[in-house]
Amino acid sequence: SETTTGTSSNSSQSTSNSGLAPNPTNATTKAAG
């Protein structure tokens, strides 16, 4: 059977079940020190 679980970040629909956000945010980083 064929599956289509990936999605485009252009899509207004979030990922169905790929497990990844449609346009992941950059993780915030703390300054060293």
Partner: antibody, heavy 115, light 112 residues
């Protein structure tokens, strides 16, 4: 049934190059983001690179440690994703998995970088 | 990067007994669409990882309902209501909310 089959691993000297390939079947390849994830005893599982869809202008992301050395690409007509690896380092050693997201994983291909 | 911390490192469980694995993230995994992209994987010995759960609590096709995912924000749990022999392996949490995607260090489930 979804199948992802990686190839191209092997023994490479530090500073050398290698290209990995992953052929997908059982899914509409052109509708999936494709990723490479690697696994090593030292670092565990580590996401390496991602290539998105034609509708996203094939947007690409890399983990910082491989930027400028690795290049991900895809050929939707051949249902294949590639990882070109240059200037390889000992810390690049590991099993490289092709994945669609977190859902489908290949069996992996082993890369060893050693002199 | 988002740090994913799993506990315990090793879990030794008798068949038929419950098991619980914790996963904590250094930042909230709640995405702007209201979904939380937290996944659980199982890597059996000699095999590649296989996903069990996505979006915190959704079971993948074919995964027994003895696997239960829960949590929110930064604190997540995978529970196995009754461990079976086929459950042995290493369990990983992985977040897909923030770039780069990051994995927990793994929890090895052993059968007593």
């Amino acid at each position: 049934e979804v199948n992802l089959e990686e190839s191209g691993g092997g023994l490479v000297q530090p500073g050398g190059s290698r290209q990995l390939s992953c052929v997908a079947s059982g899914l509409t390849f052109s509708k999936h983001w494709m990723n490479w994830v690697r696994q090593s005893p030292d670092k565990g599982l580590e996401w390496v690179a991602q290539i998105q869809l034609k509708s996203d202008n094939y947007a690409i992301r890399y983990v910082d440690s491989v930027k400028g050395r690795f290049t991900i690409s895809r050929d939707d007509s051949e249902n294949t994703v590639y990882l070109q690896m240059n200037n390889l380092r000992a810390e690049d050693t590991g099993i490289y998995y092709c994945t669609t997201g977190t859902d489908y994983w290949g069996q992996g291909t082993t890369l060893t970088v050693s002199s | 990067d988002v740090v994913m911390t799993q506990t315990p490192l090793t879990l030794s469980v008798t068949i038929g007994q419950p098991a619980s694995i914790s996963c904590r993230s250094s930042q909230s995994l709640l995405y702007s669409n209201g979904k939380t992209y937290l996944n659980w994987l199982l890597q059996r010995p000699g095999q590649s990882p296989k996903r069990l759960i996505y979006l915190v609590s959704n079971l993948d096709s074919g995964v027994p309902d003895r696997f239960i995912g829960s949590g929110s924000g930064t604190d997540f749990t995978l529970k196995i209501s009754r461990v079976e022999a086929e459950d042995l392996g290493v369990y990983y949490c992985v977040q897909g909310t923030h770039f780069p995607y990051t994995f927990g260090g793994g929890t090895k489930l052993e059968i007593k």
